[in-house]
Interface confidence: low
């Protein structure tokens, strides 16, 4: 079967790094600098991306793969293959269309992306609060308040007024 | 006129499967590298995989990989996507679109793709 194809097609012959070109008897031409073909008997190069920008290099391209790109320092990625980069915040902060707000009283974010999301609210599991939230912590829940040993006491905070998601403008 | 037609959407529940097909017509169908995308309601299209002119090279977003498998029959003009366990966020309205010869863009970008089908639904739900 692949000889019989080879015969029909003799662009399936061309390897990887290489495309049929059409313009020259469909002999196999080394991709053009700047472009690849990741499989053989490619008709055309795919051009290779380029990292510019606020995107730089995480893998260089070769004539059979595409380069890599990932963000530069303060930017994370977003998307599939790293096709956006987004601003980092601090800790305690989120990304709103006017930049980084700090996260409302009651919230809390641990990383330098996404929302601020509410914190945990103990009592739902029967829990009390044993170390208050933060802007960057979420509260940690120890046990209930029957649990506690006489004159143990525990801080419970109010709760969040606000939906997730959103930072005082 | 270039025309790209998907089918086989429907409902399904989680753990199952659906084989989706997009028919061309209106070009050179063979010459292309085509891809299937997807977009939930209120999200961005996402790329799902792509499958080169001559079925040689894939590339699959990671979070399908191993669940979801194009393929390509260039003499029926017709692009397939066999997807199994599915799972509700793999809810979304799912197209397909052909490749440009050449493109600046990644190709998991819908930049790289010109021409697009008009979608078929996939619903996973219990």
């Known amino acids: 079967f692949e000889r019989t194809r080879s015969l029909q097609d003799p662009c399936s012959n061309c390897p990887a790094g290489t495309f049929c070109d059409n313009n020259r008897n469909q002999i196999c031409s080394p991709c053009p600098p700047n472009s690849f073909s990741s499989a053989g008997g490619q008709r055309t190069c795919d051009i290779c991306r380029q990292c510019k920008g606020v995107f730089r290099t995480r893998k260089e391209c070769s004539s059979t793969s595409n380069a890599e790109c990932d963000c530069t320092p303060g930017f994370h990625c977003l998307g599939a293959g790293c096709s956006m980069c987004e601003q980092d915040c601090k800790q305690g902060q989120e990304l709103t269309k006017k930049g980084c707000k700090d996260c409302c009283f009651g919230t809390f974010n641990d990383q330098k992306r996404g929302i601020c999301r509410p914190w945990t609210n103990c009592s739902l599991d029967g829990k009390s609060v044993l170390v208050n939230g933060t802007k960057e912590r979420d509260v940690v829940c120890g046990p209930s308040p029957a649990d506690l040993s006489p004159g143990a006491s525990s801080v419970t905070p109010p709760a969040p007024a606000r939906e997730p998601g959103h930072s005082p403008q | 006129e270039v025309q790209l037609l998907e089918s086989g959407g429907g409902e399904v529940q989680p753990g199952g499967s659906l084989r989706l097909s997009c028919a061309a017509s209106?070009?050179?169908?063979?010459?292309?590298?085509m891809a299937w995308f997807r977009q939930a309601p209120g999200k961005e299209r996402e790329f799902i995989g792509r499958?080169?002119?001559?079925?040689?090279?894939?590339d699959y977003v990671e979070s399908v990989k191993g669940r979801f498998t194009i393929s390509r029959d260039n003499p029926k003009n017709t692009l397939y996507l066999q997807m199994s366990s599915l799972r509700a966020e793999d809810t979304a309205v799912y197209y397909c679109?052909?490749?440009?010869?050449?493109?600046?863009?990644?190709?998991?970008?819908?930049?790289?793709?010109?021409?697009w089908g008009q979608g078929t639904l996939v619903t996973v739900k219990p």
């Open positions: 499958l080169a002119w001559n079925g040689g090279s894939t």
């Open positions: 679109a052909r490749q440009r010869s050449y493109s600046r863009y990644d190709i998991r970008t819908p930049q790289t793709y010109d021409y």
């Open positions: 209106g070009w050179a169908f063979g010459n292309y590298g």
